[in-house]
């Protein structure tokens, strides 16, 4: 009887039971009652990751520097190019096929995270007590300065984007 | 339904080249090795060797590698085997065939190399 | 390269008997994925072979059931188990495990 399914790494064509090509390989020929699979390499530029019948490999990515993008890592016969940004870029998207700049965080809020070739900055709003002034991709909130240890008073009080003034204490005559 | 048609007969002089052809209908051309066998009256059976109408590539019995050429114009779904400075032991029934959902042979053709 | 023996040279047999072909390799015919690429088939006189079984057991479509094959490794055999007329002609086996594919040298089947 012919099968009707056939074993992990295999595929049914023709009432045949043929093997899967292995990852890097893709198909020349289906299995015959009289010959095995044939299956020849990927070229240099090209990939297939998995068990496979394709006939046809995949194009590695191409990280296009006018697009902000650099190899992270080269593709091999199994695996693609995998493509990150240019310093003070991340990826617009989880395919990375463009950059944008990293964001700044404004006054008022500081970096929670500093961004990466695939991340943006994370920014955080300034709790009481800290404050930014700056518009930064990489300054954190800042703590207001501590009058008492300086031997000073507040005269103005800090915000979220302005440190407290310190000035002298009032000497009692 | 499968059909691989070859000429009857060829009728070449010593020292010549020969072409010939097997007309594949009735399936995807592309899908499907062609071989070529040589039978010579009380000699059996020789294989000649094969190629992939995809790309072009071939397999070969080392025997016939300088005297076999194989083929294919995928436009008219057509394999060729040329065979070259031929003398008496060309002589011989050649037959093409393909495999894969069932084994076809084509009715052959009778070579004879005679001055 | 592969030498397919077989035997014997000539079978004379009466319509109902059973026929037995042998088929030996010089080396295994057990391909690496398994298989056995081990075949038969029949030519008539002034006609293309005719393949009867493939991969040492398996028999094409439209192939009666009185054709078996059997064997392993470097071993084989065909069996008819009741001639009939139209079986006559000159039996082969091939194998298409390792290159160059090789033929035996075929048995003629006829009528005592």
């Known amino acids: 009887e012919p099968p009707t399914a056939c074993r992990e790494k295999q595929y049914l064509i023709n009432s045949q039971c043929c093997s899967l090509c292995q990852p890097g390989q893709k198909l020349v020929s289906d299995c015959t009652e009289f010959t095995e699979t044939e299956c020849l390499p990927c070229s240099e530029s090209e990939f297939l990751d998995t068990w496979n019948r394709e006939t046809r490999c995949h194009q590695h990515k191409y990280c296009d520097p006018n697009l902000g993008l650099r190899v992270q890592q080269k593709g091999t016969s199994e695996t693609d190019t995998i493509c990150t940004c240019e310093e003070g870029l991340h990826c617009m998207s989880e395919s990375c096929e463009s950059c944008v700049p990293h964001r700044s965080c404004l006054p008022g809020f500081g970096v929670k995270q500093i961004a990466t070739g695939v991340s943006d900055t994370i920014c955080e709003p300034c709790p009481v007590g800290f404050f930014s002034n700056v518009s930064s991709a990489f300054e954190k909130c800042r703590p207001w300065t501590s009058c008492e240890t300086k031997d000073l008073v507040v005269q103005q009080a800090g915000t979220n984007k302005t440190d407290v003034v310190c000035g002298p204490q009032d000497r009692q005559r | 339904q499968v059909q691989l048609q070859q000429p009857g007969a060829e009728l070449v002089k010593p020292g010549a080249s020969v072409k010939l052809s097997c007309k594949a209908s009735g399936y995807t051309f592309i899908s499907y090795y062609i071989y070529w066998v040589k039978q010579r009256p009380g000699q059996g059976l020789e294989w000649i060797g094969g190629i992939n109408p995809r790309n072009g590539g071939t397999n070969f019995n080392e025997k016939f590698k300088s005297k076999a050429t194989l083929t294919v114009d995928k436009s008219s779904s057509t394999a060729y085997m040329q065979l070259s400075s031929l003398t008496s032991e060309d002589s011989a029934v050649y037959y093409c065939?393909?495999?894969?959902?069932?084994?076809?042979w084509g009715q052959g053709t009778t070579l004879t190399v005679s001055s | 390269d592969v030498v397919m023996t077989q035997t014997p040279l000539s079978l004379p047999v009466s319509l109902g008997d059973q026929a037995s072909i042998s088929c030996r390799s010089s080396q295994s015919l057990l391909h690496s994925n398994g298989n056995t690429y081990l075949h038969w088939y029949l030519q008539k006189p002034g006609q293309s072979p005719n393949h009867l079984i493939y991969q040492v057991s398996n028999r094409f479509s439209g192939v009666p059931d009185r054709f078996s094959g059997s064997g392993s490794g470097t071993d084989f055999t065909l069996k008819i188990s009741r001639v009939e007329a139209e079986d006559l002609g000159v039996y082969f086996c091939s194998q298409t495990t390792h290159v160059p594919w090789t033929f035996g040298g075929g048995t003629k089947l006829e009528i005592k």
């Open positions: 065939t393909r495999h894969g959902n069932g084994v076809y």
